[in-house]
Structure formats: structure tokens, C-alpha cells
């Protein structure tokens, strides 16, 4: 509340994160021209990336283009961008959809398409959609462990959001346990009225607000966090401003002389802490 | 404007950039002792790396040292390093300039130079200039969409700097169009008044400032982003506060049942996305 | 000092930090089954990652889990996990503590003992304690430079902690050189009464605090920085709540056509650069 | 006591080949360059080619392209294939190696010598 008497100056935070869980990714996958199902286990290892402590990264789904090299080949026939002869095709043209640059002739795609050749990682991406369901939509069930130092230097006050008497095998519930800082990543969505099951295709940002309004004044102190969730990103977002959340990232390696890379478009869910408030003292 | 009679609470923000483009790269490679010319294609899992929302990196230069293993060998000789016997050298020491410890031996460098032998990755890095002109130089052409979400929470007021009615095909102008939210890299260097073919050879950090005046009483309500930007690093800084923007890193694989490492110092303009602003309402 | 008549404005601040320094790690390696004394260097590229401007991460120390390959084995026998028939083993259970989702059978984990078996990266992890001492616990002696660039819009001031005056071979001294901005880790401990060996045991957060008390009045002009130092995590923190600062990375690679990795879990301290401050004018 | 054990010595006509080894054996802690030198008759020890412990090699002009130097480092051992023999390349051919016996305690050593005769 407003005590217009007291001295107020805004929180200095610092966040650390812990998430927590196993996913079991069931995908088909290709080797040597045959089809057959995978099965793999991703742990923190494998589906979160070490971030900074106000945000952190939890992949929820991904396309991999595996065994790329640096050579030509014909671009993707994403729409428009087929060809019939050379004359459509631009020496030297970066197309910022396409991605290499332009050779100036056009080839066959496959059977029945031609696009112009590239310079380029190949054979190029696919712009397939993001599989549905998501790979790793089990991830709904992992929990993250937020840590919280404040500091309000003018009062030379520092507190935390865990304390020494809480349990480390809680769960965040806004009636129940509104004090643990351990939430279940599907309950935060939940919170925050939203469906995790079907952000995890395309990825999302999350916020996770943490508020101090901080009374200091020894006679009436009070300072403890609160808890809420709100949905970051635009889901009513126009194609052309790339929906959701997605990175691409490469694991490269040498074969037969030669450097190759695998390339990983990962979707999925960064979390965003958001820490504020006030410290007041008369 | 400052309205007295306004409560006026600061902005929390969160920030979602997403690069495009794609770099032509040519450069001399030796291999097996003979030098050719290398011409490869950089698209972004090559030069940016996943960063946290209110900072994005861009390699925009390189020097590579490809497969040094941890060994014995002479330090690079850098001015004040060469040695004549074992005297100079000093077994255990670990210079700072240096990359590895001392052994206690003085031994050729090269046919006419003899410098103190290190257990370090080896050889060690050459100190070698920065390829100029910067070998992703064109990355002036590339463009970031950059998504900003604020929220008042003491007016319980959220918006984003992206509207539905905006044309993803759009590029920021000043004049034109100030309120687009796709940015030309070159623009934002022209715009605060630098050359990017210059900053691309050492790197550099940009700002891009973000300020939110918002009026959100509702018979006056404003509440757009103005956008700004300046360089942040120090353009005439002294050599040995380290001038532009560059860091190492490592990749690691094994051969002949060594572990190998290719070190790469990545130059490349660090963009920060600063928001700041404050919503008043009566 | 409070000027009542000024006008304040809270600081905008963008960080750049560059760590110098190598360290020797000497460690018992097993290789075909023979134990060895293991000896290498670890320079910036091998400690350190490239993160965002206001923190910075250094490796202090780790515990590798080489060569594991997704397939089937018993888990680590941790407190409770033993098992004596299948009965105690759930199909499809996916136990948190655990890195992987049980088959339902119970199976020897060594000649004493026996635990469920789970589908995962194998061989599992062990929990054992992190190395004591601290693996790279000369990082003690690295040095990190901070630069920080500050600007107050409102009143059209902008200025940075480096000076054209100051001398790149100095080191901070809260007395001697308060104002030089390169610190040696083992000093920041110090100046927070905190103890460098013990915290690079487990890894911890470290606060560099960054103070701006600006009068912008051309009459009085005063705008330099004040350097303190915090620890945030919390040292004496429950087991539950994972006390310490470690994070888990995975290096992955290709043998006999099997994808293989390698596991990293990373201790080491985290720094935060909190700036904060205001400018205040007539 | 460490030691670096040369084989393949011999005799061989004009255009044969050989393929000289040499182990390092005994207590240590790494073996880093290793290398093959030669004396002839009558001549000063020369370098015929080295090799890093990252496999980072270097030859003679006068064998560059006919001799090739690689390492098993499993094994601790540095091999030559000399291909393409001519009489003079007929010496002793010796091994060395620079081996650390602790960390950061280096020491040169050189093996016995075999010896390459190249005559019709």
C-alpha cells in the first residue's frame, strides 16, 4: 500500500534457476533410407541451455536437418519460389527467405519442381512445420526451482524468497503453498490461463512476475514475495512476425575430410523472471 | 511531458529478437601446407549465438587456431617474450599475457627466434591482427525483428511495440516508418552516427534504446515506443582495455586418442536492447 | 547525498566484462581400466561461456560422465533406491531424482547391490561429491575487467568507469584503487568476507555492485562509480533447495555409429554486475 | 628408466620402401614432439621430419613427398614410411622425442639408431 511518508526505493535483484525433469521423445527417424520409430530420453543436459538467471530456456520441440555441407544444391520450394529456366535465378542474389546465394541457374528440386540453385549449407532446411504433438510436450511436468536474493542498498536491507524453515519437496500453489518456489512448468501456464500442450509446438515466452512491496519500518516489516504469470509473446501473431519462440543452433563435426553439421531448429518455452517492487521506510 | 499530478510507475519489459541473413565468407585456408582460397556461407546458428531477450550477438570477424592439442611448445613472441637461454624462463610461471606455464626451457620458436616453452593448448594462438576488411562484413545487411512486451503493473496496463496492423515486410526508418520494428544493421550504425564496416573489424556494443512515455489516462492515452541508439563501448579506448568486443571459444573433438580443440576469437557487434520509460496515470 | 530540489533519474546501464587468467588442473584419469595422473590447462575458451554483459560465469570445477550412450541400465543407487525383486520397480515411472524412466525390472548395479533398471544416458551419472579441493581453485588469481557504459536520457548525460587517465595494469583496491575496474576474483571474495576456496568447492553467486551517485548540476558535478561486493546464494541452504551454483552441459559426438556424449556438470561462481544509482539535476 | 626402442632397419634396393618405428617406453608422464633425424657417412645428424602431439607435421626438402612420419599415441610411438629410396638417403636413422617425465619436467631423449642402407 501507498505510505506516502516513507522513503521508497526500487529492488536490486538476483535470480538463479534449477529446472528439474526426464522427457521420453518418440519420433520416426531415417537412417539409410529406411523409416523406423526412435526412442531417446532427454534430461536438463539436453533440453535446456545455461543461461543467464532472469531468463532460462526449456526446449519443448525441434526439426533437425542432419549431415549438412557447404556445397550447391537447389533451394527450398517454399512458395514463389520455384523456377522454369536460368533467366528466374540471380548470380549472386541472397534471398533473405532463401538461405545461400544464388548460382544464376535452375535445377531440378525433384521430380516435378525446379528451384535456383544455391551456395549453401546443404541440402537446405525443409520448412516443414513443427511436429504436433511436440516432442518433448512431457516437459509440461518438469518443475523449476527459483531462487531470489533482493537488496535494497539505501535501507541496507537483503532478504530471499527461500527460507531456512520451507520444504525442498514443495510445490507452488497460489492457495495452498503461495511461499514455494518450486513450480511445475504445466502449472504455471495453467496459472496463467494458457495451454502448454499447445504453446510446446511453436515455443512461447512465459513470464514469471515476482513482486516485492516491501514495508520496512520495524514496527509493521513485512517482505515477501508474489507470485504471478503472464504470457509474453503474441499469440495472435501475424506470420510474417514469427509466432512462438524458436532459435537455430549447429553441432558441426568432420567426416571423410569433410566439415558437416547438423542443424537444430529448437522450439520452446524461455521463461522470463521479472523481478520488482519497493522498499519503504520512514 | 512531466505531469505533476500523474502516479508514475517504471516500465518492466521483455524483449524477443529474432536475425536474419546470410554471409558470403572468403578466405584464405591452408591445408596440408598449401593455401587456397576458402569461400563458405554463414547463415545464423553460424554467427549468432541463443542469448538471453535484451542482448543478441553478431560475429562479424574471426581468427581461428584449428587443432591445437594440450602439449609442449614454444610461446607466441610477443613483444618482450623471445629468450636466449634458459635463465629467461622461469619453470611454473604463468604469465598473464601468455596462454600456458612455463616449463623452465628456452627453445626455437622459429629459424631465428627463440621464445620460453609452455604446456599449453598447442601451438598457441598467434597474436595476429583481425582480418580487415572483416571477413562477415555484409552483415550490415542483415535485419532483427525485435518483439518488446511492457507491462505498468501498479496500472495493471500491458502492450507491445508490434500492433496487428503492422506489415512484417517493413524496415525501420527514422522518418518514414519509426514505428517498424525491423531493423536494417547498417541503419542502426548509420543512425548513431557510425560505420559498420569499421566496428565489424574489432566489434563493438550497440545500443538500442526503447522509451516508453505512456499517458494511460484515458482521455489522453499515448503509448508507443520511441526508438534510439548509440554505441556503447569505448571507440578510443587504450589497447590495453581491450577495444571492441570479442571472446573465445572452443570446439572439441578427439583424434589419434587426443583430445583436439579448433579455439575461435569471434569479433562481433553485441547489441543491447535498453528499455526504459514510465506510465503515468492520474 | 538527497538534493530535495533535484530531479532524479534512475540509471540505464550496459556491462561488458573480459576474465584473464589459466589454470593448471591436475586429476586422477582412467583410460582401458588404468588410473593416471591427468594434467592440463584450462584458459578462458575452457572455463568460461560467452554470456550477456551483466554476468559472468567462471568454472571453478566439475565431474565428467565420459562415453554414455542412450540403452538400458540399473540406476545409481542412491539413498532408497535400492531394489530386491522387480516388484519395487515401476514401468514407465520416471522417479525426479532419477535420469531415466524405469523398465520394471530390478538388476545389479555392482556385486552388492541391485536397482531398477531405466532406459537413459548410460552409464548414469554418479552422485558423487564435487572434487575437494576445487579442481580449478587457482582461478582464485584470474582477473576480470568490467566495463560499464551508463547513461541518464532524461538529462542527456552519458559516461563510463574507464577513463582516458586510468592505467590497464592496475588492480582494484577498495583503499589504494577504488576506481580501477579490474579485480581479482580472490579480492572480490575478500571484500565480501567470503572464501574463495570453499565456495569454488560447489560454485556460488557473487554480487559486484555498481553504484552510481550522480549531481549533474554544473555547479557541484560528481559522477564516478563505488564498487562493493555480496554473496547471493545462500551458503547455508538446505540440501533440497541445491545449495551451491553448478549447471550440467553435454558435449556430443559419433563412435561406431552410436551418438555418444559427454557430460559436464559445471560448479563455478556466478557474477552479477548490479548497477544501479540515479542522476540528479536542478 | 625411459627408453625409445627403434625396428626396421635394413637393407633395400633404389625406389623400395622401409617403414622404420620407435617406442617410447618406461614411466612417464606425456611424450610431446617426436622426430625422426639422420646421420650419413661422413655428414652432420640432420632432421628428416617431426611430428607434433597434435599431429602437426614437418619434412626435409630432400624427403618431402617420398617420406611420411605419423604417431599411435596409445602406443607412444612415432613411425617413418620411406617410400621411393634413393642411395642417399643410406644412414643411421635415429629417433627422438621430447617426453615429460612429471609435469613440466622435459627431457630430450634419443633412441640407439637403425640403420638404412640404400644400394643395388
Known amino acids: 500500500s501507498d505510505k506516502l511518508y516513507q522513503r521508497k526505493e526500487p529492488v536490486i535483484s538476483s535470480v538463479h534457476t534449477k529446472v528439474k525433469g526426464i522427457a521420453e521423445v518418440t519420433e520416426n527417424v531415417t537412417e539409410g533410407g529406411v523409416t523406423k520409430l526412435g526412442h531417446s530420453i532427454f534430461d536438463t543436459a539436453d533440453y535446456t541451455f545455461p543461461l543467464q538467471g532472469n531468463s532460462f530456456f526449456v526446449m519443448t520441440n525441434y526439426v533437425k536437418s542432419e549431415g549438412q555441407v557447404q556445397t550447391l544444391c537447389p533451394e527450398y520450394p517454399r512458395r514463389g519460389a520455384q523456377c522454369s529456366s536460368d533467366r528466374r535465378c540471380k548470380k549472386g542474389w541472397m534471398d533473405p527467405q532463401s538461405k545461400g546465394i544464388q548460382t544464376g541457374r535452375c535445377v531440378p528440386y525433384d521430380k516435378t519442381r525446379k528451384t535456383c540453385e544455391v551456395s549453401a549449407w546443404c541440402p537446405t532446411e525443409e520448412e516443414k512445420e513443427a511436429p504436433r504433438p511436440a516432442l518433448l510436450r512431457s516437459a509440461e511436468n518438469f518443475t523449476v526451482l527459483i531462487k531470489n536474493n533482493i537488496h535494497f542498498p539505501g535501507h541496507n536491507y537483503t532478504t530471499r524468497n527461500i527460507l531456512p524453515t520451507m520444504n525442498g519437496s514443495c510445490t507452488f500453489h497460489k492457495t495452498w503453498d503461495p511461499q514455494c518456489s518450486i513450480f511445475r512448468l504445466g502449472d504455471i501456464f495453467q496459472e496463467a490461463g494458457e495451454n502448454f500442450t499447445e504453446v510446446a509446438v511453436q515455443g512461447g515466452i512465459m513470464g514469471i512476475e515476482i513482486y516485492w512491496d516491501c514495508n520496512l519500518d520495524s514496527w509493521s516489516h513485512h517482505c515477501r514475495p508474489r507470485y504471478s504469470f503472464r504470457r509474453l509473446d503474441d499469440k495472435n501473431m501475424d506470420e510474417s512476425f514469427v509466432p512462438g519462440y524458436n532459435f537455430r543452433y549447429a553441432k558441426y563435426y568432420k567426416e571423410n575430410n569433410v566439415e558437416k553439421r547438423t542443424l537444430i531448429k529448437a522450439f520452446g518455452i524461455r521463461f522470463d523472471i521479472l523481478v520488482f517492487g519497493t522498499g519503504g521506510k520512514f | 511531458s512531466d505531469k505533476l499530478y500523474q502516479r508514475k510507475e517504471p516500465v518492466i519489459s521483455s524483449v524477443h529478437t529474432k536475425v536474419k541473413g546470410i554471409a558470403e565468407v572468403t578466405e584464405n585456408v591452408t591445408e596440408g601446407g598449401v593455401t587456397k582460397l576458402g569461400h563458405s556461407i554463414f547463415d545464423t546458428a553460424d554467427y549468432t549465438f541463443p542469448l538471453q531477450g535484451n542482448s543478441f550477438f553478431v560475429m562479424t570477424n574471426y581468427v581461428k587456431s584449428e587443432g591445437q592439442v594440450q602439449t609442449l611448445c614454444p610461446e607466441y613472441p610477443r613483444r618482450g617474450a623471445q629468450c636466449s637461454s634458459d635463465r629467461r624462463c622461469k619453470k611454473g610461471w604463468m604469465d598473464p599475457q601468455s596462454k600456458g606455464i612455463q616449463t623452465g626451457r628456452c627453445v626455437p620458436y622459429d629459424k631465428t627466434r627463440k621464445t620460453c616453452e609452455v604446456s599449453a593448448w598447442c601451438p598457441t594462438e598467434e597474436e595476429k591482427e583481425a582480418p580487415r576488411p572483416a571477413l562477415l562484413r555484409s552483415a550490415e545487411n542483415f535485419t532483427v525483428l525485435i518483439k518488446n512486451n511492457i507491462h505498468f503493473p501498479g496500472h495493471n496496463y500491458t502492450t507491445r511495440n508490434i500492433l496487428p496492423t503492422m506489415n512484417g515486410s517493413c524496415t525501420f526508418h527514422k522518418t518514414w516508418d519509426p514505428q517498424c520494428s525491423i531493423f536494417r544493421l547498417g541503419d542502426i550504425f548509420q543512425e548513431a552516427g557510425e560505420n559498420f564496416t569499421e566496428v565489424a573489424v574489432q566489434g563493438g556494443i550497440m545500443g538500442i534504446e526503447i522509451y516508453w512515455d505512456c499517458n494511460l489516462d484515458s482521455w489522453s492515452h499515448h503509448c508507443r515506443p520511441r526508438y534510439s541508439f548509440r554505441r556503447l563501448d569505448d571507440k578510443n579506448m587504450d589497447e590495453s582495455f581491450v577495444p571492441g568486443y570479442n571472446f573465445r571459444y572452443a570446439k572439441y573433438y578427439k583424434e589419434n586418442n587426443v583430445e583436439k580443440r579448433t579455439l575461435i576469437k569471434a569479433f562481433g557487434i553485441r547489441f543491447d536492447i535498453l528499455v526504459f520509460g514510465t506510465g503515468g496515470k492520474f | 547525498s538527497d538534493k530535495l530540489y533535484q530531479r532524479k533519474e534512475p540509471v540505464i546501464s550496459s556491462v561488458h566484462t573480459k576474465v584473464k587468467g589459466i589454470a593448471e588442473v591436475t586429476e586422477n584419469v582412467t583410460e582401458g581400466g588404468v588410473t593416471k595422473l591427468g594434467h592440463s590447462i584450462f584458459d578462458t575458451a575452457d572455463y568460461t561461456f560467452p554470456l550477456q554483459g551483466n554476468s559472468f560465469f567462471v568454472m571453478t570445477n566439475y565431474v565428467k560422465s565420459e562415453g554414455q550412450v542412450q540403452t538400458l541400465c540399473p540406476e545409481y543407487p542412491r539413498r532408497g533406491a535400492q531394489c530386491s525383486s522387480d516388484r519395487r520397480c515401476k514401468k514407465g515411472w520416471m522417479d525426479p531424482q532419477s535420469k531415466g524412466i524405469q523398465t520394471g525390472r530390478c538388476v545389479p548395479y555392482d556385486k552388492t547391490r541391485k536397482t531398477c533398471e531405466v532406459s537413459a544416458w548410460c552409464p548414469t551419472e554418479e552422485e558423487k561429491e564435487a572434487p575437494r579441493p576445487a579442481l580449478l581453485r587457482s582461478a582464485e588469481n584470474f582477473t576480470v575487467l568490467i566495463k560499464n557504459n551508463i547513461h541518464f536520457p532524461g538529462h542527456n548525460y552519458t559516461t563510463r568507469n574507464i577513463l582516458p587517465t586510468m592505467n590497464g595494469s592496475c588492480t582494484f583496491h577498495k583503499t589504494w584503487d577504488p576506481q580501477c575496474s579490474i579485480f581479482r576474483l580472490g579480492d572480490i571474495f575478500q571484500e565480501a568476507g567470503e572464501n574463495f576456496t570453499e565456495v569454488a568447492v560447489q560454485g556460488g553467486i557473487m554480487g559486484i555492485e555498481i553504484y552510481w551517485d550522480c549531481n549533474l548540476d554544473s555547479w557541484s558535478h560528481h559522477c564516478r562509480p563505488r564498487y562493493s561486493f555480496r554473496r547471493l546464494d545462500d551458503k547455508n541452504m538446505d540440501e533440497s533447495f541445491v545449495p551451491g551454483y553448478n549447471f550440467r552441459y553435454a558435449k556430443y559426438y559419433k563412435e561406431n555409429n552410436v551418438e555418444k556424449r559427454t557430460l559436464i556438470k559445471a560448479f563455478g561462481i556466478r557474477f552479477d554486475i548490479l548497477v544501479f544509482g540515479t542522476g540528479g539535476k536542478f | 628408466e625411459v627408453q625409445l626402442v627403434e625396428s626396421g632397419g635394413g637393407l633395400v634396393k633404389p625406389g623400395g620402401s622401409l617403414r622404420l618405428s620407435c617406442a617410447a617406453s618406461g614411466s612417464f608422464f606425456r611424450v610431446n614432439n617426436m622426430a625422426w633425424y639422420r646421420q650419413g657417412p661422413g655428414k652432420q645428424r640432420e632432421l628428416v621430419a617431426d611430428i607434433t602431439r597434435g599431429d602437426r607435421t614437418n619434412y626435409a626438402d630432400s624427403v618431402n613427398g617420398r617420406f611420411t612420419i605419423s604417431r599411435d599415441n596409445v602406443r607412444n610411438t612415432v613411425y617413418l614410411q620411406m617410400n621411393g629410396l634413393k642411395p642417399e638417403d643410406t644412414a643411421v636413422y635415429y629417433c627422438?622425442?621430447?617426453?615429460?617425465?612429471?609435469?613440466?619436467?622435459?627431457?630430450?631423449?634419443w633412441g640407439q639408431g637403425t640403420q638404412v642402407t640404400v644400394s643395388s
Open positions: 627422438y622425442a621430447t617426453i615429460e617425465l612429471g609435469v613440466l619436467e622435459p627431457r630430450d631423449y
